[in-house]
């Protein structure tokens, strides 16, 4: 056959149903490779055409949309099972042509299968609610375009394996799960389930998310830099090593990048020429306020090492500090022999 | 679609026990609970228990508990429903019913056991 | 166990009557209430799931409402065919536990 602008497969998009389940699949080609959309496709006399290569197997073939009850079908772009088999798992190709054009690309669908309390191989998307912070809401996702808004479903929201009924600050409000007051113990994975008629069947729809609640930007500050600080004073004779550890409280904000680095007389470590080494360790609260700590490590340090200045920086959303640490040359302690025997006047 | 087909009507005697089968088609079997419900003659209706064949966890009301054991076969699609020590009050239509959440969407057609001397 | 109280037992309505069965949950269930319609000598059918939510297939003239502990299953329109008993089961706290049924029948 004829040249074909093949997008290879898209594992970006590795698309996870549960088994049993309606899904409706969107081909890819016209949301992340391609400048125009189905409609502008489909006027210009482009047509969709689907195929798959099931588990374990090299053989492309194509999709079988006459199955009892239209359990496969296609409408527009949009590829719908009604519902899901395990055995549905494989990767599937979309290829937009006509006798001129030709596009596709494939990608990876997984049909998984749940246990009764919900858990299962899905990656969980997480949500994230600042502690103590009044009413939070979260959303059932991905339940647009299942049913018309003339269908009014059911949704059962779920905490792990239980009903969310008489909760004292969670409260299910239909696609909505209210939290009054978000706290430590609302971490968890919350799963809602959406029951809706079509054509005299019953269908389920299940989300599962993870909850996790985190530092309020009410309560937060400016790094903190905990070492170095000004009782401590690293005193050193040259040839020993000189450790130095930066100490960082962050507090937990949303899409802030925090930063620790160190410079010396000025420099970053990389630009001068002496051996230094940084590690950093990261550490996280109950609420992910962030502790990082890099430790500047001189194995041998010389009399001019001892006199350079060291400086620790942190910098976050909320601010950027920087503190030196105190460096000296350690005074050598007296020899008995020769200094203390002068002292009693020994000739 | 979705089936439940239970095995046929059995006669026991007093204290022994009686295995019921209830064959599903027509959906994901793993995927869903299956509860078992009785009935006495002429009376309504009473929930025994269920169970998730994908991962075989179960639940039983506290009257059955110990009497009755609930399994499920994932490669026939079958779930069974063992009551011992079988009592004259024992004698009932004893139903499976399919749900993928709580509510029992499915029902198999009953089968009566009657236990009698 | 939650109790299910079931009224009336029994009733007796002509063809095109709107019709009203009740149901008291002796806590509160959350909506979690299904109602059963088992015709004489079959299975019970779901009819209603979560106090209000029409299962696929039933006839719109049946509709659920209720909330608490008092629950109303309405038949809009008696139907020759609605002849049945109906229960409501709650699935708030197991063990599931049903009504003890109400008896339709036509006048």
């Known amino acids: 056959s004829e040249r074909c602008d093949d997008w290879g497969l898209d594992t970006m998009r590795q698309i996870q149903v549960f088994e049993d389940e309606p899904a409706r699949i969107k081909c890819p080609l016209f949301e992340h490779f391609l400048k125009f959309n189905y409609s502008t496709a489909h006027s210009a006399g482009l047509t969709l055409i689907w195929y798959w290569t099931r588990q374990d197997r090299d053989l492309e073939e194509p999709i079988n949309f006459r199955l009892p009850e239209n359990r496969i079908s296609k409408e527009k772009d949009v590829l719908w099972f009604r519902p899901t088999l395990l055995n549905d798992t494989g990767n599937y190709t979309c290829m937009l042509r006509n006798t001129t054009y030709c596009s596709k690309v494939a990608f990876p669908l997984e049909v998984v299968q749940k246990d009764s309390c919900f858990n299962s191989p899905m990656k969980l998307p997480v949500h994230k609610l600042y502690i103590e912070y009044g009413i939070q809401r979260i959303t059932c996702p991905n339940v647009d375009g299942y049913f018309p808004s003339s269908v009014k479903p059911t949704i059962t929201w779920y905490m792990g394996c239980y009903k969310i009924q008489n909760f004292n600050n969670v409260i299910p409000e239909g696609m909505n799960l209210s939290f009054l007051i978000a706290l430590i113990s609302n971490n968890g994975n919350y799963t809602c389930v959406v029951t809706y008629p079509e054509n005299g069947r019953t269908f389920h729809l299940t989300r599962t998310l993870t909850v996790k609640v985190v530092g309020s930007p009410k309560n937060a500050v400016p790094p903190v830099i905990h070492s170095p600080n000004d009782h401590v004073v690293y005193e050193k004779e040259p040839g020993e090593e000189l450790l130095i550890p930066c100490t960082v409280y962050f507090s937990f904000l949303m899409d802030s990048r925090n930063e620790v680095w160190w410079t010396i007389d000025g420099k970053k470590p990389d630009d001068i020429t002496i051996d230094v080494t940084i590690n950093e360790s990261i550490s996280h609260s109950r609420t992910e306020d962030e502790t990082r700590t890099q430790i500047l490590s001189i194995k041998k340090v010389t009399s001019e090492d001892l006199k350079r200045s060291y400086v620790c920086h942190a910098r976050s959303a909320k601010g950027e500090v920087a503190k030196a640490a105190k460096v000296k040359q350690k005074v050598p302690a007296p020899r008995y022999t020769v200094e203390l025997a002068c002292g009693f006047g020994a000739t | 679609q979705v089936q439940l087909v239970q095995s046929g009507a059995e006669v026991k005697k007093p204290g022994s026990s009686v295995k019921v089968s209830c064959k599903a088609s027509?959906?994901?079997?793993?995927?869903?609970?299956m509860n078992w419900v009785r009935q006495a003659p002429g009376q309504g209706l009473e929930w025994m228990g269920r169970?998730?064949?994908?991962?075989?966890?179960?639940h039983y009301a506290q009257k059955f508990q110990g009497r009755v054991t609930l399994t499920a076969d994932k490669s026939t699609s079958t779930a069974y429903m063992e009551l011992s020590s079988l009592r004259s009050e024992d004698t009932a239509v004893y139903y499976c019913g399919e749900g993928y959440l709580d509510p029992m969407d499915y029902w198999g057609q009953g089968t009566l056991v009657t236990v009698s001397s | 166990d939650i109790q299910m109280t079931q009224s009336p037992s029994s009733l007796s309505a002509s063809v095109g009557d709107r019709v009203t069965i009740t149901c008291q949950a002796s806590?509160?269930?959350?909506?979690?209430l299904n109602w059963y319609q088992q015709k004489p000598g079959k299975a019970p059918k779901l009819l209603i799931h979560?106090?209000?939510g029409l299962h696929a297939g039933v006839p719109s003239r049946f509709s659920g409402s209720g909330s608490g502990t008092d629950f109303t299953l309405t038949i809009s329109s008696l139907e020759p065919e609605d002849v049945a008993t109906y229960y409501c089961?709650?699935?708030?706290?197991?063990?599931?536990?049903f009504g003890g049924g109400t008896k339709v029948e036509i006048k």
């Open positions: 979560y106090t209000s």
């Open positions: 169970i998730y064949p994908g991962d075989g966890n179960t």
């Open positions: 027509g959906y994901a079997f793993s995927s869903s609970w």
């Open positions: 089961q709650q699935y708030s706290i197991l063990p599931w536990t």
């Open positions: 806590q509160g269930i959350n909506n979690y």
